[in-house]
Every structure is written in structure tokens, then in C-alpha cells.
């Protein structure tokens, strides 16, 4: 059976959006009005993976681009990236585990934790414009809480 | 010091199970990360990546033979097992198990191999 | 699938050689290759990982470089010890596939 996916955008419990920062990276800022046109659309994929009432593994493509977030180490941290794949064999139901995370719903918030990463967390800034990236903390300074906004197709 | 030993039947005949063992110390399989895979090789052949089993027990197969393979680990007892069904003589080679931590896998450690002979 | 193709299957070098072995990948694999070394007595080591990371304790005389589809290990001055074959791994997309391996024997 083929993959199920949905679209949407993410936006971090102080409502920046997240848009694209050069061809490989994510930003998170503060958008308004038609600015709003700008923020990233995910191809959200519901992939293999362990799973529970609130704990579900996702893969987080772009929609129509051939890129996905995914995790891996880099000079010894774990690390957030834009990688290219080959649009003719993703999104798939086995996804690598670098692409996996489990997408984590609180109190109507949602986190979005590395499978191959237990403990880090897709993240941003308290400032604006900064890049998003794969944080060991939660409840600190950085933002690690979500909301979700569904996309028509 | 990491060492992985390969265990198995030596000979069995065709449509039989192959039932390996893979026994390890030096590291551990509730480490988050670590993974532990299995590759054959037939003899004077390349290399083929088999299977993979994580941390987590999430696993991984390869396609081309993912209805015969079946792979577990029993953590506490630092060992990964394959099985590989209904065998044939195409499936005669040396298996090997190896250790990768995280995606994309560096298999950094390997084990000696073990030859296993498919004949009637 | 991608396929990982090693278009010299062996390869006859001098000790004291500089030697360069190629790794072809059918599509992009985004450095996601490693290099393995298995010695006549079948024993397999890990020589590079993540296209150009040298593994601990191997040897400063191997190197790994390439980018995209192409990629290739250099020994820069070949030894005796070095005589085994030669194998490369792509970790990009499951099933991971490995190269058919370059038998590298002394002249």
C-alpha cells in the first residue's frame, strides 16, 4: 500500500513560521498578511516505525521538492539537515531511520523527536530568524513545542 | 575491545532453515544508536548486505529477500540471530555480522564469518 | 536499487605505489560512502567512512574523496600489508549495496 501523507505547515508555540534560509536550511520567524505565502509546506508521511496512542513516526518532506529532513551526525553531534533524495522512491513506507522522527502530541502541542536520536528535538530560537535544529534540551530557552496547520492538496 | 562471532549450521540441505547466531561483547544493543547487520558472501563473490536490526528493534531488510529473512537480537544476552528460509544452493556463502551505529551505517566492527554450505 | 559499480575488478601496483581505487554509484549518494579492506584471509576492516573520514588506527596512507555518483580510496605509498580487496559501501537509501570489490595485488 502506498505511503499516506498529508500537507501542512508547522509553526512554534510563538507562532514563527518556518521558511526556507538557501537551498539546505530552515529558518523560523515571525510572518504576517502575504508574508504568510512564504512559510515551508511539509509533505507530512506516516512511515514504519514504533508507535503509540500519542507517539507517532513521521517522515517531513517538502512538498514537491525532492528534500526531507533528517538527523545525523555531524563532528560528533547530532545534526538537522535538508537532504535530497530521489522523488522516484520517497516518500516509502520504510523510510532510513535518519528521517524518521516521532511526532509527540501535549496538551494540543506537538514534538517532533528523532527516532535515530531519542531525547533531541526539532527546534528554534527564542530569536528571530534563526535556523532550525535538532536541540538535546527541552523546557529550556529553545522552542521545541509545535502546532499544526492542515494544507488543502 | 568490540569482537562479534558468527555461529551456524556449517551444512544444510535445500528448503531447510538456516538459523545463524550472532554473539558479541565490547558494546551493547540497548545502546541508542547501535545497530548490528547481517552481510553473506558467496565464495570468490562480493558483498551482500542482508539485514539490519537497531537498538529499538526496528529492522531492516533487503527487498530482494525480505520474505525468507527474519532477524532478532536478545539484548540481554548480547546476540543478533538471522533466520533465512526455504534454502537453496545459491544461498551458500560466508556470513558475516557486523556492527553500525546510526543511519547512514559504517559497518565499524565485523566478525569472522562463518561458512555455510547449501547442498543435497 | 542504486548499484555501486568498481569498474577495475583487479589491480597489480608496485610497493611504494600510489593506488587509486574507483566506486561508481547509479545516483546521487550524498558522501554517504564508506571503504572496507578484506584481507586474504577473509578477515573485514573499515577503512574510511563518510567519503573521507579516516577510521582510528587505520593507516594515514589511505584516503577517501569524491562527491555526487564518484568516488575512489587513494593509498599513497602502497605496502606489503595492503594486499587484500578493496569493497565500497553506499549507506544512502536501504537496501545499502556494496561495490564488487577491487582485488589489488602486488607487481
Known amino acids: 500500500a502506498p505511503v499516506r501523507s498529508l500537507n501542512c505547515t508547522l509553526r512554534d508555540s510563538q507562532q514563527k513560521s518556518l521558511v526556507m534560509s538557501g537551498p539546505y536550511e530552515l529558518k523560523a520567524l515571525h510572518l504576517q498578511g502575504q508574508d504568510m505565502e512564504q512559510q515551508v509546506v511539509f509533505s507530512m508521511s506516516f512511515v514504519q516505525g514504533e508507535e503509540s496512542n500519542d507517539k507517532i513516526p513521521v517522515a517531513l518532506g517538502l512538498k514537491e521538492k525532492n528534500l526531507y529532513l533528517s538527523c545525523v551526525l555531524k563532528d560528533d553531534k547530532p545534526t538537522l539537515q535538508l537532504e535530497s533524495v530521489d522523488p522516484k522512491n520517497y516518500p516509502k513506507k520504510k523510510m532510513e531511520k535518519r528521517f524518521v522522527f516521532n511526532k509527540i502530541e501535549i496538551n494540543n502541542k506537538l514534538e517532533f523527536e528523532s527516532a535515530q536520536f531519542p531525547n533531541w528535538y526539532i527546534s528554534t530560537s527564542q530569536a528571530e530568524n534563526m535556523p532550525v535544529f535538532l536541540g538535546g534540551t527541552k523546557g529550556g530557552q529553545d522552542i521545541t513545542d509545535f502546532t499544526m496547520q492542515f494544507v488543502s492538496s | 575491545q568490540v569482537t562479534l562471532k558468527e555461529s551456524g549450521p556449517g551444512i544444510l540441505k535445500p528448503s531447510q532453515t538456516l538459523s545463524l547466531t550472532c554473539s558479541f561483547s565490547?558494546?551493547?544493543?540497548?545502546?541508542?544508536?547501535?545497530?548490528v547487520g547481517w552481510i553473506r558472501q558467496p565464495s570468490g563473490k562480493g558483498l551482500e548486505w542482508l539485514a539490519h536490526?537497531?537498538?529499538?528493534?526496528?529492522?531492516s531488510y533487503n527487498p530482494s529477500l525480505k520474505t525468507q529473512l527474519t532477524i532478532s537480537k536478545d539484548t540481554s544476552r548480547n546476540q543478533v540471530f538471522l533466520k533465512i528460509t526455504s534454502v537453496d544452493t545459491v544461498d551458500t556463502a560466508t556470513y558475516f555480522c557486523?556492527?553500525?551505529?546510526?543511519?547512514?551505517?559504517?559497518?565499524?566492527?565485523w566478525g569472522q564469518g562463518t561458512l555455510v554450505t547449501v547442498s543435497s | 536499487d542504486i548499484q555501486m559499480t568498481q569498474t577495475t575488478s583487479s589491480l597489480s601496483a608496485s610497493l611504494g605505489d600510489r593506488v587509486t581505487i574507483s566506486c561508481r554509484a547509479s545516483?546521487?549518494?550524498?558522501?554517504?560512502l564508506s571503504w572496507y579492506q578484506q584481507k586474504p584471509d577473509g578477515t573485514v576492516k573499515l577503512l574510511i567512512y563518510?567519503?573521507?573520514k579516516l577510521h582510528s588506527g587505520v593507516p594515514s596512507r589511505f584516503s577517501g574523496s569524491g562527491s555526487g555518483t564518484d568516488y575512489s580510496l587513494t593509498i599513497s605509498n602502497l605496502e606489503q600489508e595492503d594486499i587484500a580487496t578493496y569493497f565500497c559501501?553506499?549507506?544512502?537509501?536501504?537496501?545499502?549495496?556494496f561495490g564488487g570489490g577491487t582485488k589489488l595485488e602486488i607487481k
Open positions: 557486523a556492527r553500525a551505529r546510526y543511519d547512514p551505517p559504517w559497518f565499524v566492527d
Open positions: 565490547g558494546f551493547s544493543l540497548s545502546t541508542s544508536g547501535m545497530g
Open positions: 536490526i537497531w537498538w529499538d528493534g526496528d529492522e
Open positions: 545516483q546521487d549518494i550524498s558522501n554517504y
Open positions: 563518510y567519503t573521507s
Open positions: 559501501l553506499q549507506g544512502k537509501m536501504l537496501p545499502w549495496t
